[in-house]
């Protein structure tokens, strides 16, 4: 059993048919020694008297609020949460596996650039009775400083019969230098406590694995005289590191027509701009990534060719 | 990435071209090695992420841009020689870039030119023959050397008498291929402000 | 909204079997731990088996263990209770409930119930 939080307590439980389960000893935070009665949750059901009580934690009726009282006054509470392995494994209920960009990932982060913030992102469908808590550093065994803002929900979808949840949650690297060669990774930590079922996640990076750039901005058109081409042209995303010329970007330039079936022309270009022959009807997008460390690209931003 | 490469302007920057010859070259060699010890811990995840030029040289504060030189965060070490030396800047205005950073980048080089070099001779040994240093990558350190063109003591290619331990020879050429290649963008990312400068 | 629908009810003698069945609809059943819970004229609720979302592991009251088994098909959002050796005492109305905290033998820790089939064994 460990301490969560004040009053609150995670008892570890590895559950299997007929698990004895844990012993765990509650004391009544008080000066008082006799007439303490124990009950649980809004039960008035007596379990046990005196300062301490001894339970036998099997199973998740066993956890909830115990409060002692003396002669109908509250004194203190204990919130026990159980966090349960099953074969072994410990519970992965609360979140859903993304399975990308393998399975088993519950935590996505991403980083617009180099300045050492990010932000992580899961999803669940459960819809009521569930907190989350956040916590990073950079390193495990010395951490530096991370600091993360409170989770917010900031996404729902209907996925077939059920609804979907995605939260996200904002970091910032206490000390970062753009420029820095990562060679301790950035770890995050999720609490996730549903109804009385405790669980965490973690995620492992470095900064530079997780970049995916704004798309470019201020993407314009130039027909050219006397010619089917037109010049594009395009500007580094306002949140991308600077100086440009130190975090460079490469960019892919396609014209898409509007049937998916329709041959995609693509170019590749350092510059921010390319000439392109531009069909009736078609698209052209550009999107971006890190010129010299191939994380992911940006998402398009797109122009129409009329 | 398999993209189209423009060629470099013969008036550009000449260590423009080899670095990006050489980020090619060592991200390729780390590909074949990931893939070829897949059975190895070779990637990312699963390596100690270890600098051989640790405390011996201070590329990313000696070569940081004139514009993070505000950051507080990237200034713990940094040393504030202005001189300018060595053929990569003959033809241009670098007061604000200092000897420092490219003998820096020159001495990493170097180092990391030994051991690979230490290391191909283990791997040579193998009767697997299963993995080999890509002569190009090597050939393209060179090349980057000579065009910096520091003059420096040549190092002396280390030699081990006891019988190399294979399986660690490789775990140590992934540490080293993923140390080298993030000091190759590192040398990219420079090149590129210099020759914008 | 989630409906759940138990049937295979009924009379039954002593000694005999019974297989109850309930049909969950309008959520993903394959996200929630399913259990059965049973109330006899006078008594309280009680819980009588559960099993888990992902494992299909199982969890039983220990009055009905080694006579009572629960299974669950995914694919067809059902849960079953196969009752063999059956008891005057197993006479009740049989709900079918889920919920997202396995293992738990507490009513409170259910989110969706079933309106019930009764069981009823003859001596």
């Known amino acids: 059993i460990w301490e969560l939080k004040k009053d609150v307590y995670v008892v570890e439980l590895d559950w299997y048919p007929d698990a004895p389960g844990e012993m765990v000893v509650l004391t009544c935070d008080t000066p008082e020694e006799d007439g303490i009665t124990w009950t649980l949750d809004q039960s008035s059901e007596v379990l046990g008297s005196g300062k301490t009580l001894t339970i036998q934690v099997k199973e998740f009726g066993d956890a909830g609020q115990y409060t002692c009282h003396k002669g109908g006054e509250v004194l203190s509470h204990s919130l026990l949460l159980l966090h349960k392995k099953e074969d072994g494994i410990w519970s992965t209920d609360i979140l859903k596996d993304q399975k990308e960009p393998k399975n088993k990932t519950f935590l996505r982060c991403e980083a617009k650039n180099y300045s050492g913030r990010f932000t992580c992102w899961w999803l669940t469908t459960i819809s009521t009775d569930l907190t989350f808590s956040v916590k990073s550093s950079r390193g495990s065994s010395d951490p530096q400083g991370v600091t993360c803002g409170a989770a917010t929900l900031s996404a729902e979808r209907v996925r077939g019969d059920n609804k979907e949840y995605e939260y996200s949650v904002e970091c910032q690297e206490d000390s970062a230098c753009p420029a820095a060669e990562e060679s301790l990774p950035i770890e995050v930590m999720v609490d996730a406590v549903h109804k009385l079922k405790y669980e965490n996640y973690t995620s492992s990076f470095f900064i530079r694995d997780i970049i995916k750039p704004d798309p470019p901005k201020n993407l314009q058109l130039k027909p050219l005289k006397n010619s089917r081409q037109v010049e594009v042209s395009w500007e580094y995303p306002d949140t991308w590191s600077t100086p440009h010329s130190y975090f460079s970007l490469t960019f892919c330039v396609q014209v898409q027509g509007k049937s998916k079936r329709e041959k995609k022309d693509r170019v590749f270009t350092d510059k921010t701009s390319a000439t392109v022959i531009c069909r009736k009807n078609a698209s052209i997008s550009v999107r971006a990534q890190d010129r010299y460390y191939s994380s992911s690209w940006s998402e398009w931003a797109s122009v129409p060719c009329s | 990435r398999n993209l189209p490469v423009a060629t470099p302007d013969p008036g550009m920057f000449p260590c423009l071209h080899h670095s990006q010859n050489l980020l090619r070259a060592v991200s390729n060699m780390l590909q074949k090695a990931r893939q070829t010890l897949e059975f190895y811990p070779c990637t990312s995840e699963e390596i100690d992420h270890e600098d051989i030029t640790k405390d011996k040289t201070s590329t990313v504060e000696a070569c940081l841009p004139l514009e993070l030189t505000k950051n507080e965060s990237c200034l713990n070490s940094r040393e504030t020689s202005f001189i300018t030396n060595g053929s990569c800047l003959a033809s241009r205005k670098t007061s604000f870039m200092m000897a420092l950073c490219l003998s820096s980048i020159y001495e990493d080089l170097k180092m990391y030119q030994v051991e690979f070099k230490t290391m191909n001779a283990k791997l040579l040994m193998d009767p697997k023959r299963q993995i080999f240093l890509d002569q190009n990558m090597l050939a393209v350190i060179d090349e980057l050397m000579q065009a910096l063109n520091f003059n420096s003591e040549t190092v002396p290619q280390k030699s081990s008498l006891e019988e190399p331990d294979f399986y660690k020879t490789k775990i140590k050429l992934c540490i080293l291929l993923h140390a080298f290649r993030i000091r190759a963008v590192t040398i990219d990312r420079v090149m590129s402000y210099l020759n914008a400068s | 909204e989630v409906q759940l629908v138990e049937s295979g009810g009924g009379l039954v003698q002593a000694g005999g079997s019974l297989r109850l069945s309930c049909a969950a609809s309008?959520?993903?059943?394959?996200?929630?731990?399913m259990g059965w819970f049973r109330q006899a004229p006078g008594k309280e609720r009680e819980f009588v088996a559960q099993?888990?979302?992902?494992?299909?592991?199982?969890y039983y009251a220990d009055a009905v263990k080694g006579r009572f088994t629960i299974s669950r098909d995914n694919a067809k959002n059902t849960v079953s209770l196969q009752m063999n050796s059956l008891k005057p005492e197993d006479t009740a109305v049989y709900y079918c409930?889920?919920?997202?905290?396995?293992?738990?033998?507490?009513?409170?820790?259910?989110?969706?119930w079933g309106q019930g089939t009764q069981v009823t064994v003859s001596s």
């Open positions: 099993i888990s979302r992902h494992n299909s592991n199982t």
């Open positions: 309008g959520r993903t059943f394959s996200g929630y731990d």
């Open positions: 409930a889920i919920g997202s905290l396995f293992p738990s033998s507490r009513e409170r820790d259910y989110d969706y």
